[in-house]
């Protein structure tokens, strides 16, 4: 978590002199409670906005906006503490609006906003606005919190941000997967404009289940410059397991900007449609069925063969 660097942070507006300060997230009013404290924020809204740094990089930011309640407690409002908590890492970043003049009665409702917290693609946050001074230990809370989920890099607006581009968001492999026969799968995709290797991860599933019945990994060496943006095709050999017919193909690139953490793209081939008329049940049922293989997973001694070509 960090603040966008691109200009001096301002919170002043007509009728209010205000300065933005870094905060330890532990306001002095926690330690030295006051007798009279303001009421809580109203209508807290968090939206995804985008902002450029001085260097011209584009980042997603949390746009935080709230209003004041129309009560006399605005006379005791000395500022606000804005806190962004990343839920998974428990990392917190705070800033403080410090009012340098007293708020006066106003024809319109007082409204505040702040758009300088940089957020990460796909991450989850809790945003809190505390009015200051904070209440005495048994006082009514004077803060409001909202959760905020940042879309991942597949989202159209996110795709062009600097963090997403660094993880390969502009590469569209346009994957096509075709079942050639019960034992072969053909995968076609478009190479990116970088001499880097790729990995194809194949995971197969039974028709209605989410637990894999076959897994295979295939390495594609780095293409030469003349092969950039060209289609590459690979034929993967499947394990002939009855009912193991739904195949998910995932392509993992290893671009220099993101290494092992690049965005992966996937495509799925569904099982063939079942015929509408059920097969007739035989007059007798066999006592056992022949075994169709001892292991569900591909091991080192039993690799699926595959070959690949780059097309110009």
């Amino acid at each position: 978590l960090r603040l966008l660097d691109h200009r001096a942070l301002v919170c002043s507006q007509p009728g209010l002199n205000c300065t933005v300060k870094n905060s330890t997230c532990l306001d002095d009013s926690w330690i030295h409670p006051r007798n009279l404290t303001p009421s809580s924020p109203k209508d807290l809204q968090i939206q995804l906005h985008f902002a450029h740094t001085q260097q011209g990089d584009l980042f997603p930011v949390a746009h935080i906006e709230w209003t004041l309640q129309t009560d006399a407690s605005i006379l005791y409002l000395e500022g606000a503490e804005l806190s962004v908590l990343q839920l998974n890492t428990n990392e917190r970043l705070c800033v403080k609006f410090q009012f340098l003049s007293m708020l006066q009665h106003h024809r319109k409702r007082w409204r505040f906003s702040f758009s300088h917290f940089v957020v990460d693609p796909g991450q989850e946050y809790e945003v809190t606005v505390h009015h200051l001074p904070k209440p005495i230990p048994d006082g009514d809370p004077n803060h409001q919190s909202k959760n905020f989920l940042v879309p991942d890099c597949e989202h159209a607006r996110m795709k062009v941000t600097t963090p997403c581009m660094s993880s390969g968001s502009l590469w569209d492999p346009n994957i096509t997967v075709e079942t050639l026969d019960t034992q072969h799968l053909r995968v076609d995709f478009t190479l990116w404009n970088e001499s880097t290797h790729y990995q194809i991860l194949l995971t197969s599933f039974p028709h209605m289940e989410n637990h894999s019945c076959f897994e295979h990994m295939h390495h594609i060496p780095a293409p030469r410059p003349e092969e950039f943006h060209q289609r590459s095709n690979v034929t993967l050999t499947l394990r002939n397991l009855k009912g193991c017919c739904r195949h998910q193909v995932q392509i993992q690139p290893f671009f220099s900007s993101c290494l092992n953490d690049c965005l992966r793209h996937s495509a799925t081939v569904s099982c063939p449609e079942m015929p509408d008329t059920p097969e007739p049940i035989p007059d007798y049922m066999p006592l056992w069925e022949p075994r169709s293989g001892s292991s569900d997973y591909k091991d080192d001694d039993d690799k699926g063969s595959s070959h690949h070509h780059h097309h110009h």
Epitope: L87, N88, N147
Partner: antibody, heavy 116, light 107 residues
């Protein structure tokens, strides 16, 4: 391929405890939180809480506070949910799911039956 | 806590037709809404989050419209695999809460 695989069905007596496991694969457990949601037979979904494997931080629904404990073991990429003082109305399918707000991958569910 | 109300409880639609499912929040949740699909004996599957962003691999026939308190999930042309129960969920504030579900069945 992200997968969350849960432990098998359990039958428990009222007053007992149950501990359900959820093994994550296809991603790093510490990259996302794990949430727990339950579903009573023929009913809707009920959020129980979440744990961050990265920080160990937890948030529990008030209803389960003091009765539930969520933990993780990063060495085995496994999350656990323990529910104590079981009652008959705790009979449900218990799901683990990845993330803390919009839950993008779910385990297959573990049926916990509480019956005397 | 925020109460999520879904309607109708059951929706009968023919394959190829449009299905419209409604979800109402007891207070404004901005766009902090997710939709899930659940088939019998299976776990829920995330369809949409942020009230309009489709999750990975979800076809374009699923879309959401709304913000604040009123949301609508639209399935533009129902396929055989779309007959299931659909739940909405708010993640605006704790605790996370789900709607009671809408069952979409074949007419």
């Amino acid at each position: 391929q992200v997968q969350l695989v849960q432990s098998g069905a359990e039958v428990k007596k009222p007053g007992a405890s149950v501990k359900v496991s959820c093994k994550a694969s296809g991603y790093t457990l510490t990259s996302y939180g794990i949430s727990w949601v339950r579903q009573a037979p023929g009913q809707g979904l009920e959020w129980m809480g979440w744990i961050s494997a990265y920080s160990g931080n937890t948030k529990y629904a008030q209803k389960f506070q003091g009765r539930v404990t969520m933990t993780t073991d990063t060495s085995t990429s496994t999350a656990y949910m323990e529910l104590r003082s079981l009652r008959s109305d705790d009979t449900a399918v218990y799901y683990c799911a990845r993330r803390q707000l919009a839950l993008d991958y779910w385990g297959q569910g573990t049926l916990v039956t509480v019956s005397s | 806590e925020i109460v999520m109300t879904q309607s109708p409880a059951t929706l009968s639609v023919s394959p190829g037709e449009r299905a419209t499912l409604s979800c109402r929040a007891s207070q404004s949740i901005s766009s902090n809404l997710a939709w899930y699909q659940q088939k019998p004996g299976q776990a829920p599957r995330l369809l949409i989050y942020g009230a309009s962003t489709r999750a990975t691999g979800i076809p374009a026939r699923f879309s959401d419209n709304g913000s604040g308190t009123e949301f609508t999930l639209t399935i533009s042309s129902l396929q055989s695999e779309d007959f299931a129960v659909y739940f909405c969920q708010q993640y605006d504030t704790w605790p996370l809460t789900f709607g009671g579900g809408t069952k979409v069945e074949i007419k």
